[in-house]
């Protein structure tokens, strides 16, 4: 069983009094159908809460909303609905919060049917004041901020126009018509697809991909026969229709679309899809759907150019386009990802990789856990994690797995222990080493969150009954204390804490119901007095990530280097603090074949670290398409894994000879690219 409140646990002294002095209740004088909450800026303490109520009438929606603001992390709220002239705010657009600490907020209002355009309310002072602006168009999407300049906004209109503002929504200009999808790239570049004939749907596979680097003064067509496009890390991807049939292929560019290369990935048919699961500046994880309605596909990992792909994982669960996948980046430890596979018997199993997709394995069975009914062998089984797919299937799973970059090594997730994911009520498990080992943390489903960079974990039981108890742990989930935060239980709807896990405040949201009334209520608990002193050097200990065998000279080496971290000792009850920076020390490892992926035309036989030539290509000149030219590849079959920092040791070399022949690609080649000006 999970550790409880017994004599073995180091109890925090006088915590009830300390927490009672730091528990703040706020009752909202309405109960509207929904509540949405947004944090404005980082470490500002500003929260906006929008409560909305709407009744769809025959010709229009009648609605009401209220806007509340807190500037003390949710301890107190002020009704600021008058700042937006008591206007009904459209919840489907949410609250568009500006990047970083810009303090910018855009709220999109509901307007009456006959109006010329929409209406927005803009704030650039962390929602202290709002300016009403009437738009020359009806927005179809939420306003999108440029990541580089929060004054630059783009939006699509219901008429498929692409609109841009250069002064934070004060003035708007339509820069292009017939636009299907638009995205900000780097350096204030906008990428978008356009249709020529009927509509986005009708022209799917015949769209053009355009780019503007000057907010619509001039344009460049960078692709034709486009089905869709996506951005990931420094890569621009486009799926492009083939000339001969209805299949499409991925093309990739690392220079904003000036030159393209065909990705060495299988082509897909009409019913299939590609999906970028994760991407960074080094590489990309790409899911390629299997033909037919299988619900699975294959994960491929790219080289540093996004062109050569290695098969990473078969039978990867991904239900449909835009459907559910359990693919999760474990942000608390470099190189770790968790996902689910659909096995031959249609059961779902969890897999984990510690080396960025190089090898996948089952999760180790937690110590002191029994294998459940799904296990053939009661002594040998694995932990299986519930994520998006389980949530979509309405299993009793209130939350997806949780990890935070500044809470090193910590992963919290619902799971079951057996041969496959179980439909039984799950328990909550924790790993403190990035997924290598697991322990049952709490019995039954819970909501959970990480505070103070891992110094505190907070949990609330998932129950259909009203609740008034919160649990917290100061030792990474080993021991738990319970605190009754109110005498009158509430129907719990959610836990809210500031993104980034640096805060020591948690807000518990819910509503109360009595005979005649029901009201939204929030309780904000500040844990600062539980962690009453700042952590010192003696509170930290040194930890080697990815350690599996101390007797191995290269223990801890992942992607060519090992990292040692200063981690808070489990027995230390102290504040990491808002300014806490993870202290780590990398050291370079010697290269081995594990640090290389197989180059184009090569593959790794199972359980072998050597790359061998693909049989169908044996003896052929390896010619492939790169930057719109045909290349001849002289290789011994290896290419360094993206992001790998190893030095010395094994060093297989490769060489590329440029044949300077144009590729016969149906994709728009560089010399055909045209520039247009507005």
């Amino acid at each position: 069983s999970a550790p409880g409140e017994d004599e073995e646990c180091g109890r925090v002294r006088d915590f009830v009094a300390k927490l009672a002095n730091n528990t703040h209740q706020h009752v909202f004088d309405d109960l509207r159908a929904s509540v949405s909450l947004s944090w404005v800026g980082d470490s500002t303490g500003v929260i906006l809460v929008l409560t909305t109520f709407h009744v769809p009438l025959v010709i229009m929606t009648f609605g009401q909303s209220k806007l509340y603001r807190s500037e003390d992390y949710g301890k107190n709220f002020k009704d600021i609905t008058d700042l937006i002239n008591n206007t009904f705010i459209r919840t489907e657009f949410g609250m568009a919060i500006g990047p970083e600490n810009s303090g910018k907020v855009v709220l999109t209002a509901e307007v009456s049917g006959g109006s010329r355009g929409g209406r927005i309310f803009r704030s650039s002072d962390f929602a202290k004041n709002f300016v009403q602006t009437d738009l020359p168009f009806h927005p179809l999407t939420q306003m999108m901020y440029s990541p580089q300049n929060s004054d630059y906004l783009l939006a699509l209109s219901t008429e498929n126009g692409l609109w841009v503002s250069k002064n934070f929504g004060g003035k708007w200009e339509e820069i292009h018509k017939a636009v299907c999808l638009a995205k900000w790239g780097s350096d204030n570049t906008i990428f978008f697809t356009t249709y020529a004939n009927g509509s986005c749907k009708a022209d799917l596979g015949a769209l053009e991909l355009w780019r503007t680097s000057d907010l619509g003064k001039s344009f460049k067509t960078i692709g034709v026969k486009i089905y869709s496009f996506g951005l990931g890390g420094r890569f621009l991807f486009a799926s492009v229709m083939a000339d001969k049939d209805t299949t499409r292929r991925i093309h990739v560019s690392t220079d904003q679309g000036d030159t393209w290369s065909m990705a060495q990935l299988p082509s897909v048919g009409q019913e299939q899809f590609y999906s970028i699961l994760a991407a960074n500046d080094d590489m990309v994880f790409m899911h390629v759907d299997e033909p037919g309605d299988t619900g699975f596909g294959t994960i491929f990992t790219s080289d540093d150019r996004g062109i050569v792909y290695s098969k990473s994982l078969d039978r990867h669960l991904y239900t449909t386009t835009g459907g559910e996948t359990d693919f999760t980046n474990v942000t608390s430890l470099r190189g770790v990802y968790i996902t689910s596979v659909l096995s031959e018997d249609n059961s779902i199993q969890t897999m984990i990789t510690f080396d960025q997709g190089g090898r996948w394995t089952h999760l180790r069975k937690p110590e002191n856990s029994e294998c459940d009914a799904t296990a053939k062998n009661k002594n040998e089984c694995s932990l299986h994690i519930h994520a998006s797919y389980s949530i979509s299937q309405k299993l009793n799973v209130p939350m997806a797995p949780l990890s935070e970059p500044n809470a090193v090594g910590i992963v919290i997730a619902h799971g079951s222990v057996g041969d496959a994911i179980s439909v039984m009520v799950p328990d909550v498990y924790i790993s403190d080493d990035g997924g290598y080992s697991w322990t049952k943390m709490l019995e039954g489903p819970h909501y959970y969150t990480i505070l103070d960079s891992g110094g505190i974990i907070v949990a609330i039981e998932h129950s259909s009954r009203p609740i008034n108890v919160i649990k917290f742990s100061t030792d990474e989930g080993q021991c738990w204390q319970t605190y009754t935060f109110t005498r009158d239980p509430i129907y719990f709807t959610g836990l809210a804490s500031e993104p980034g896990a640096r805060s020591m405040n948690i807000s518990i949201w819910g509503f109360t119901e009595s005979f005649l009334t029901s009201q939204w209520v929030s309780y904000t608990i500040d844990f600062k007095d539980i962690l009453e002193r700042n952590c010192e050097e003696k509170d930290y200990t040194i930890w080697l990530a990815h350690s599996t065998d101390p007797e191995d000279y290269e223990d801890g080496c992942i992607l060519g280097y090992k990292e040692q971290f200063l981690r808070l000792r489990k027995s230390s009850v102290c504040q990491n603090g808002r300014d806490y920076v993870v202290t780590k020390q990398p050291s370079i490892c010697l290269c081995s074949l594990e640090d290389f992926l197989c180059d184009f035309g090569y593959y790794r036989p199972e359980n072998d670290s050597k790359c061998v030539e693909q049989p169908e290509l044996k003896g052929h000149d390896l010619e492939f398409c790169l930057y719109g030219r045909e290349e001849h590849l002289t290789t011994n079959g290896y290419r360094k894994i993206p992001g790998d920092k190893c030095q010395g040791g094994v060093n297989p070399v490769r060489e590329v000879k440029d044949l300077k022949k144009k590729c016969t690609s149906n994709f728009l080649s560089p010399e055909k690219q045209n520039s247009k000006s507005n």
């Epitope: 080493d433 200990t541 040194i542 350690s547 101390p550 007797e551 000279y553 223990d555 801890g556 050291s587």
Partner: antibody, heavy 124, light 106 residues
């Protein structure tokens, strides 16, 4: 089998410094922390500090902070402990010991291999 | 720093006796406790790590238990070779040792 071999006995004057070495053989020196523990005549064990050879990450007991320096040379698989401003109370047997390790934590699993000890006598 | 209090400081026992030594930490150290045996003129020898895990090569008559702040080392049947001084050591703060328990012949 891992072995830790320490340098020989030392006699030192008060106020001077002593540097004791600890050479490892037969194991992966770099992957384990080395602790230094001392034992005054007829007394108990006292931890002075430790070092992780990879990166040379050292930490010290509060009592010895500023007076002890622990270093490691990966190329020779040797750890060193230097104690300065010696006084008569520093007369003791000084041990180096390898911290056993089962996970990524260096100091949590006890000291599984010990050196033979180095006697340091501080006398005027 | 975390203080470790060991008791008793001296223990007289006979061969075949069941011997129990207690160690108390000034604050919770979870299971991060080790036990050592030391004979005169020799370096200490690790017996138990992580409160209850037996170090390889150590006879099974030695066992450890406890968690949090209270720990015990038990020798189920004392052998002639077991007369020595025993130390507990916590590993979750800066390392500290208990004062030692001398097991002598009754």
């Amino acid at each position: 089998q891992v072995q830790l071999v320490q340098s020989g006995a030392e006699v030192k004057k008060p106020g001077s410094s002593v540097k004791v070495s600890c050479k490892a053989s037969g194991g992966t020196f770099r992957n384990y922390a080395i602790s230094w523990v001392r034992q005054a005549p007829g007394q108990g064990l006292e931890w002075m500090g430790g070092i992780i050879p990879i990166g040379g990450w050292a930490n010290y007991a509060q009592k010895f902070q500023g007076r002890v320096t622990i270093t490691a040379d990966e190329s020779t698989s040797t750890a060193y402990m230097e104690l300065s401003s010696l006084r008569s109370e520093d007369t003791a047997v000084y041990y180096c010991a390898r911290q056993g390790r089962k996970t990524g934590y260096y100091y949590y699993y006890g000291m599984d291999v010990w050196g033979q000890g180095t006697t340091v006598t501080v006398s005027s | 720093d975390i203080q470790m209090t060991q008791s008793p400081s001296t223990l007289s026992a006979s061969v075949g006796d069941r011997v129990t030594i207690t160690c108390r930490a000034s604050q919770s150290i979870s299971s991060w406790l080790a036990w050592y045996q030391q004979k005169p003129g020799k370096a200490p020898k690790l017996l138990i790590y992580k409160a209850s895990s037996l170090e390889s090569g150590v006879p099974s008559r030695f066992s450890g238990s406890g968690s949090g702040t209270e720990f015990t080392l038990t020798i189920s049947s004392l052998q002639p070779d077991d007369f020595a001084t025993y130390y507990c050591q916590q590993a979750d703060g800066h390392i500290t040792f208990g004062g030692g328990t001398k097991v002598e012949i009754k």
